[in-house]
């Protein structure tokens, strides 16, 4: 259950999907990937204030305990709730092949 | 694919399962839960250095981009990989009921 989508820290400051442009070199993939040469990486970035997009009961517990013991228990963290698949053309021992990766690009985000 | 379980920061410093004792009051549950009166909350706490317990390709990408752009891209975060169910005896309008929660206690951890 997503608990709230209103960000009390101001627009764009809380957990949400961001796009970061990255080259094969940036990703350390130049030695095994041929295409694409550049990836629009979607990832989850931002703060997780109290009950914002809480993924589940565990996230709600974490919020409560972080409020009580901030030095011991970290705040919930902004991570992917689901992924978009992506295809890579990769080098193999014998040549190239097209491979689909299901866990590469974040599709949407929540706090956990 | 878990990439590595060796913590380069020293024993116990990296992402792993911790137990935090919490009362119903700590959790904000006193008004709707009768038992247990205290919960041994298992949660995932610790750093996620390069490729440590990387949950998937996305986590590996995040590590690479964090190294390049630490102010833009956060390091991967230590979160539950799976959960242990837990039963709560909760108050209802008509009395009490026994309810199982599948997403309350972390079972093991990874970095994402």
């Amino acid at each position: 259950a997503r608990n709230g989508d209103h960000c009390p820290l101001g627009p764009g400051r809380c957990c949400r999907l961001h796009t970061v442009r990255a080259s094969l070199e940036d990703l350390g993939w130049a030695d095994w990937v041929l295409s694409p040469r550049e990836v629009q990486v979607t990832m989850c970035i931002g703060a997780c204030p109290s009950q914002f997009r809480a993924a589940n009961m565990h996230a709600q517990i974490k919020t409560s305990l972080h409020r009580l013991k901030p030095d011991t228990v970290p705040a919930p963290c902004c991570v992917p709730a689901s992924y978009n698949p992506m295809v890579l053309i990769q080098k193999t021992d014998t040549g190239v092949s097209l491979q689909t990766y299901d866990d590469l690009l974040a599709k949407d985000c929540h706090c956990i | 694919a878990r990439n590595g379980d060796h913590c380069p920061l020293g024993p116990g410093r990296c992402c792993r399962l911790h137990t935090v004792r919490a009362s119903l009051e700590d959790l904000g549950w006193a008004d709707w839960v009768l038992s247990p009166r205290e919960v041994q909350v298992t949660m995932c706490i610790g750093a996620c250095p390069s490729q440590f317990r990387a949950a998937n390709m996305h986590a590996q990408i995040k590590t690479s981009l964090h190294r390049l752009k630490p102010d833009t891209v956060p390091a991967p975060c230590c979160v539950p990989a799976s959960y242990n169910p837990m039963v709560l005896i909760q108050k209802t309008d008509t009395g009490v009921s026994l309810q199982t929660y599948d997403d309350l206690l972390a079972k093991d951890c990874h970095c994402i």
């Epitope: 295409s35 694409p36 978009n84 992506m86 295809v87 890579l88 053309i89 190239v96 097209l98 | -």
Partner: antibody, heavy 118, light 107 residues
């Protein structure tokens, strides 16, 4: 496994509109990087690339035919469509659809033949 | 548009020989070139991607080379099943363009 199959009318008269369908299985056009291209080949001649549609609905056309071409997709039913308006005898050819990952044409359909004749 | 020229329309070779099919681009296309094989009555099949990388499952007697404007497909130890037409293609820029094809005949 990946398969693509083209279907079309077989015969058209000049000035009519050609509607082609590429039905595919074994992959999804919602996958980032995936696309489908249409290519044609007049009998005994070379290959001519016509149009391409990407997973994100970005479309590319051969400029020499752009005003006559429309490519579209139905991701949920795994189909890609191509329309060519005002066909002429010069459009007589075998029409192929091919799967692409980025720019990698790795699977082709068997082709569908069009004859334009009055 | 980038023009891909395969100057030899036909090439004749014998089983066991080595043959080289050439392709010239009208402008620099880097290594963004693919090669396709089309057997009689069949649809094209990918052989080489990015000028020199074999498609998965392609026998290693097929090799690609070149960059910029000049590209070569070499078939070592030609087999009878290699009787086909070979097309180069550039994907450096739209529109994608193909060479006119080179038909390989087996003596």
């Amino acid at each position: 496994q990946v398969t693509l199959k083209e279907s079309g009318p077989g015969i058209l008269q000049p000035s009519q509109t050609l509607s082609l369908t590429c039905s595919f299985s074994g992959f999804s056009l919602s996958t980032s990087g995936m696309g489908v291209s249409w290519i044609r080949q007049p009998s005994g001649k070379g290959l001519e690339w016509l149009a391409h549609i990407y997973w994100d609905d970005d479309k590319r056309y051969n400029p020499s035919l752009k005003s006559r071409l429309t490519i579209s997709k139905d991701t949920s039913s795994n189909r890609v469509f191509l329309k060519i308006t005002s066909v002429d005898t010069a459009d007589t050819a075998t029409y192929y659809c091919a799967r692409t990952g980025w720019d990698f044409f790795d699977y082709w359909g068997q082709g569908t033949t069009l004859t334009v004749s009055s | 548009d980038i023009v891909m020229t395969q100057s030899q329309k036909f090439m004749s070779t014998s089983v066991g020989d080595r043959v080289s099919v050439t392709c010239k681009a009208s402008q620099n296309v880097g290594t963004n070139v693919a090669w396709y094989q089309q057997k009689p009555g069949q649809s094209p099949k990918g052989l080489i991607y990015s000028a020199s990388y074999r498609y998965s499952g392609v026998p290693d007697r097929f090799t690609g080379s070149g960059s910029g404007t000049d590209f070569t497909l070499t078939i070592n130890n030609v087999q009878s099943e290699d009787l086909a037409e070979y097309f180069c293609q550039q994907y450096n820029s739209y529109p994608y363009t193909f060479g006119g094809g080179t038909k390989l005949e087996i003596k």
